[in-house]
Interface confidence: low
């Protein structure tokens, strides 16, 4: 016996956040892994008085303690609809079915005399049917439904008389069913029987407050189990050759502070006082845990030496229950001020360390949904995925000997103190219906798939490819708004006077009269900020730099009456100095920021983008920028993520759609101006960049979720792409969806109607497609009332906790970018596409492994889109150059300009132009590489500052 469970809270120093196997493991379970599903008799059988069944303590408790619950009589009626249960088991394809025998159905008053024939026949029929189907039965003798007569006559489990009566009942079951049953469970979760039955009074028989009674009941349950194990071991195992255990349930807990000894001690005490209470005598040294003996000496019964010897080792495997009954209600748990956690993997590790690596059957696992959820139990899929992933990790990575898994539960049924307010079944049952059809929920489909594949196959992504991006590919880095320096920071050559320093006297500078020195003209390098930018860019080894101008700085009044020439000079310097390093600029004219939308103050006060005149002001501003910088800048973005301004103009859907309309017009006016006035001489390209995350259905088994995923793309991307890239009008699907909600009185929103002139203005006003892509969202349909953009979509998002995610909960889902690129091409034709921002926040200040992982994986998928899908991908701009103070850490550099290790990783990808085969040449011809820059430098020299 090892007893070293507390070591589990000393975290593994080798844990790496980007080894996805530590978050989710794509692998299979061991061959012959035992897949099953379970039910409890009282929860699903119904027929509580039918065919001679006696009342149980729960039947009585329901009538006396649970208001608004008539009985378990409705339930799922498994006693009547046995065939329907068998069909459900067939559908899922389990290897075993764990069910419990109702003690009062066999022996109405609990005493073993002549069994109730109908009850005997029911269980016999069930067992025969399971054997016929090759489904192994795992039979629980006691799942809380003690015959009421034993409670009333003896006081139930408080009285040790029950031990022998229970043994008689077990003996009868072994005799009658043992030929067909190889796995027996004596008692299901004795902790809850004792704690809630006699401590909190939340379970039958509903006694509470007497701590001595709680521990007496626990004591008797352990002795009853031990007696039955010895009975089976001596009299039945030799010829029946089965195994017997007791299902022990527990929560899991994490320390508030992982390095704090006291917190770890509290966590150990918490586990010991729940799981250890029963596991220590049975799986450990035969006695209660030392901590409990010390703390509860006045109420905890004592095992004699002989009894300890008798208790020890009375289980052939460790049957473990990990589900909501051990977690809720939380106030009844031994939280001890620490943090309750659903980390099944760690709980299994604790059992391994504490009880010397036993073979483990997960005898109950699952979560619950609200009773209103019918067959689309999306969250249940993710809970199951998370739990199963943790079990697989425990087996494959921690070498824990889990041999089977019981999903809980086969059917919706009676859920103890929660009665019918929650559902735990993989099959939905309408309790008010006559026929009680078993309808498979999404979780049933999911579990069926898991069993069929014996685990998780990696279907989402294809293997990595080797290959390179084209020579003219833009390798970029994106920065948000650059605030111009108002004055050059180095005036040392602008003062013509000579000074002498009075070093020994008053230590002041004294001007030398009559001497005038030559000054030198202002230079770009006088701007300290620009030097910093260039140093960072040089280290990035990028070919392109995307940054945004500050409209409010360039035109403080919002019109051309007051142009800030110094700001324009600053921006011109950024571009020209970059060109000297061989780095071309992609310039964003307008990059809205939440604080004040980045608009000049007068425009902001005149209703901002709700005012159509802002679009005309933007056109004038764009024209100024094209004129002043267009000789050097060949790639322009008019507006960054106009589709995200809905976050700000969100008072109503009509505000959102109105602002979006004016943003579209602003972009189109700017593009038309460039096309007409500047393109002939400057030969640049203009577009706008859209926030373009991919969307997947949260529940792949629900049609409504597939529709919601497409609707997300329509509302998020097509909303702007359709009018500009394709038709000049909003997407028909989006217009119709909003109109339909309007007709049903669920929203008063409406998309603006476009005139023919507006459609002509908008259509075709992009030279390339620019997408900002960060993650993939998992979406589900949920009908939402209200007249805002968010509710018009009828979409909710789900966070998949098994996915690798950043501190701001951006999920790392590389294959989403490839799907996005294919969707764009399919919908809008074969055009040049730039990914104008893509990145992740990473807490690390030096070794930002998450960012390196993200870049490598996402660029792999972009390369697949280029090589395999033939998408015309022209550039990838990593987001972002430097992080901002107190903001999520997206930068390659810290806010005080310290470089992170992802820079070298990105350098390597850039110099290799992707992921080439070994020994393949990654060189491009010199002319190809430098043509643009030679021309640029020539222009730089010709144009005065």
């Amino acid at each position: 016996f090892s007893g070293d469970g507390r070591a589990i809270w000393s975290k593994n120093p080798n844990f790496t956040p980007v080894n996805e196997s530590q978050l989710f493991l794509y692998d299979t379970f061991p061959k012959n892994f035992f897949w099953g599903i379970g039910t409890g008799a009282l929860q699903v059988e119904g027929s509580w008085k039918k065919d001679g069944k006696g009342p149980s303590i729960w039947d009585h408790f329901i009538h006396t303690h649970l208001k608004n619950v008539s009985s378990t009589n409705g339930s799922s009626d498994s006693y009547i609809f046995l065939e329907k249960d068998l069909s459900a088991l067939d559908f899922i394809g389990v290897s075993f079915y764990q069910f419990s025998i109702s003690w009062p159905r066999l022996f109405p008053d609990g005493i073993v005399t002549v069994a109730n024939a109908k009850g005997l026949q029911y269980y016999s029929t069930l067992l025969d049917a399971l054997v016929l189907r090759n489904i192994e039965p795992i039979v629980t003798l006691y799942h809380w439904d003690l015959p009421l007569a034993l409670q009333e006559k003896y006081g139930g489990w408080k009285n040790d008389t029950i031990i022998d009566i229970f043994n008689d009942y077990a003996t009868y079951c072994f005799q009658m069913f043992g030929d067909r049953v190889k796995y027996w469970i004596t008692i299901h979760n004795p902790y809850l029987v004792a704690w809630h039955g006699y401590g909190t009074g939340m379970h039958a028989p509903g006694e509470k407050g007497n701590l001595a009674a709680v521990y007496t009941v626990g004591h008797n349950l352990i002795k009853a189990h031990s007696k039955v194990w010895h009975n089976y071991n001596t009299h039945f195992r030799p010829h029946q050759k089965g195994w017997l255990s007791i299902t022990l349930g527990s929560h899991w807990i994490e320390p508030n502070r992982s390095e704090n000894t006291m917190d770890i001690f509290k966590c150990q005490q918490s586990m010991v006082s729940v799981l250890g209470w029963f596991a220590n005598p049975i799986h450990g040294d035969g006695d209660y845990p030392e901590g409990m003996r010390k703390k509860l000496f006045s109420v905890l019964p004592i095992f004699s030496e002989a009894e300890k010897h008798e208790m020890r080792g009375t289980a052939d495997f460790f049957a473990f229950s990990f589900g909501p009954n051990n977690f809720k209600p939380l106030n009844t748990m031994a939280k001890m001020g620490q943090n309750v956690s659903l980390n099944l993997r760690e709980a299994l590790n604790w059992i391994k360390l504490e009880y010397n690596n036993p073979r483990i059957l997960i005898a109950e696992n699952g979560w619950f949904t609200d009773s209103r959820v019918k067959t689309e139990d999306t969250t249940a899929i993710y809970m199951m995925k998370n739990f199963l992933s943790q079990v697989l990790q425990a087996i494959r990575l921690d070498e824990i000997r889990v041999f089977g898994y019981t999903a809980w539960s086969l059917l919706d049924g009676f859920e103890w103190q929660d009665a019918y307010t929650i559902r735990r079944g993989l099959f939905y049952v309408d309790f008010n219906s006559k026929q009680k059809e078993r309808k498979p929920k999404s979780s049933a489909h999911y579990y069926k798939q898991i069993i069929r594949e014996n685990g998780f196959s990696l279907k989402e992504s294809t293997p990595d490819v080797q290959g390179q991006f084209p020579c003219d590919f833009s390798w970029g880095v994106t920065e948000s708004v650059l605030k111009p320096e108002s004055v050059a920071s180095s005036p040392q050559f602008s003062d013509p006077h000579l000074y002498v320093w009075n070093a020994t006297g008053n230590r002041l500078l004294h001007r030398v009269e009559g001497v005038r020195l030559k000054t030198r003209p202002a230079q770009c390098t006088d701007f300290v900020n620009i030097k910093k930018q260039l140093e960072m860019l040089a280290r990035m080894k990028v070919t392109h730099y995307r940054f945004a101008l500050d409209w409010a700085s360039v035109l403080p009044t919002g019109n051309l009456s007051a142009v800030n020439r110094q700001a324009l000079r600053y921006y011109r310097c950024v571009v020209s100095e970059g060109l000297k390093l061989g780095i071309s600029a992609m310039v964003t004219l307008y990059y809205p920021t939440h604080a004040h939308l980045g608009l000049p103050e007068p425009l902001l006060h005149a209703d901002g983008w709700l005012n159509p005149s802002t679009a005309e002001a933007f056109q004038a501003y764009a024209g100024l920028c094209f004129q002043e910088l267009g000789d050097l800048v060949k790639l322009w973005i008019t507006i960054n993520e106009p589709n995200r301004l809905s976050d700000i103009y969100n008072r109503s859907g009509n505000d959102t759609y109105g602002a979006a309309h004016n943003l579209l017009v602003a972009h189109a006016l700017a593009w038309r101006l460039y096309d007409r006035q500047f393109r002939p001489s400057q030969r640049g390209a203009v577009s706008l960049s859209l926030h373009a995350d991919w969307a997947e259905p949260a529940n792949p088994y629900a049609d409504s979720h597939w529709r919601a995923a497409e609707r997300f793309l329509q509302f998020e991307i097509a909303w702007f792409a359709e009018p500009l890239f394709k038709t000049g009008d909003y997407p028909a699907a989006m217009r119709e969806y909003i109109a339909s909600k309007h007709r049903r009185g669920l929203s008063s929103s409406a998309l603006p109607r476009l005139t023919e002139a507006e459609r002509r203005l908008l259509k075709g006003t992009v030279d390339f497609c620019a997408l900002n892509h960060f993650t993939t969202r998992f979406v589900m349909h949920e009908q939402l009332a209200g007249s805002r953009y968010d509710s018009d979509r009828d979409i909710q998002f789900l966070q998949d906790i098994t996915r690798l995610s950043s501190p701001t909960r951006l999920a790392v889902i590389p294959w989403g970018v490839r799907k996005l690129l294919r969707w764009v091409r399919r919908n809008y034709g074969d055009m040049d596409i730039y990914i104008t921002a893509s990145g992740i926040d990473d807490q690390a200040l030096e070794d930002d492994r998450l960012r390196k992982y993200y870049l490598g994986k996402y660029l792999q998928e972009v390369l697949k889109a280029y090589l395999i899908d033939k998408v015309r991908i022209k550039g990838y701009y990593a987001f972002k150059l430097a992080e901002e103070k107190s903001k999520p850490r997206f930068g390659f550099f810290t806010s005080d300009f310290k470089a992170k290790s992802s820079i070298q990783f990105y350098n390597k990808v850039i110099s290799s132009r992707g992921f080439p085969f070994e020994n393949s040449s990654s060189r491009c011809s010199q002319t190809q590489e430098n043509t643009e820059c030679t021309v640029c430098l020539f222009l730089v020299q010709k144009k005065p500052l």
């Epitope: 508030n256 502070r257 917190d263 509290k266 005490q269 918490s270 703390k295 209600p329 939380l330 106030n331 031994a334 939280k335 001890m336 001020g337 620490q338 943090n339 309750v340």
Partner: antibody, heavy 124, light 109 residues
Amino acid sequence: QVTLKESGPVLVKPTETLTLTCTVSGFSLNNARMGVSWIRQPPGKALEWLAHIFSNDEKSYSTSLKSRLTISKDTSKSQVVLIMTNMDPVDTATYYCARSVVTGGYYYDGMDVWGQGTTVTVSS
Amino acid sequence: SYVLTQPPSVSVAPGQTARITCGGANIGSESVHWYQQKPGQAPVLVVYDDSDRPSGIPERFSGSNSGNTATLTISRVEAGDEADYYCQVWDGNSDHVVFGGGTKLTVLG
């Protein structure tokens, strides 16, 4: 019967130091399950926790006031003392001490007995 | 640091049920305590550890806690229940006591 009683000056000048005493009876400050907190309430405002002292003499302070507070206890006198430096008119409030119970030696179960409070005005 | 959010006021007619909420990130995994404070008096603990009642507190006071919300429920409200109610947790991460901003319960009529 368990009681707690706060005592201290009614009026304090700005920049001065406030010393408050909480005298307890009916339980021992040595008891492993007992701790004492100080809480204040400016007129018409919400309760604000200041500091806590555990039975093993561990101390915990409100982050925003940590630099100005010191909590200590004298078990023999059954007293818990709170010292607050550099007083300011915004510190005008009713100051309470309250007993906290820790059940089973592990988890904190709220403040089950409070003193009646002492009102402190900070004014020049 | 941990923040608890309470509605500033709740009104209820005598004999009806009052529900006062206390929001906090994953508050369900914390133990929540509730205090009643009448004008000019010290606070009184009415519910501790989410749903337990100290002796002397009527059964009409009950509590629940799950997800991001804890709730104090007062059934069959009486005029004498009019008071300010505060929720409180022990933030184990910082070893700090945290109070909610308080809710004024007004009994109408």
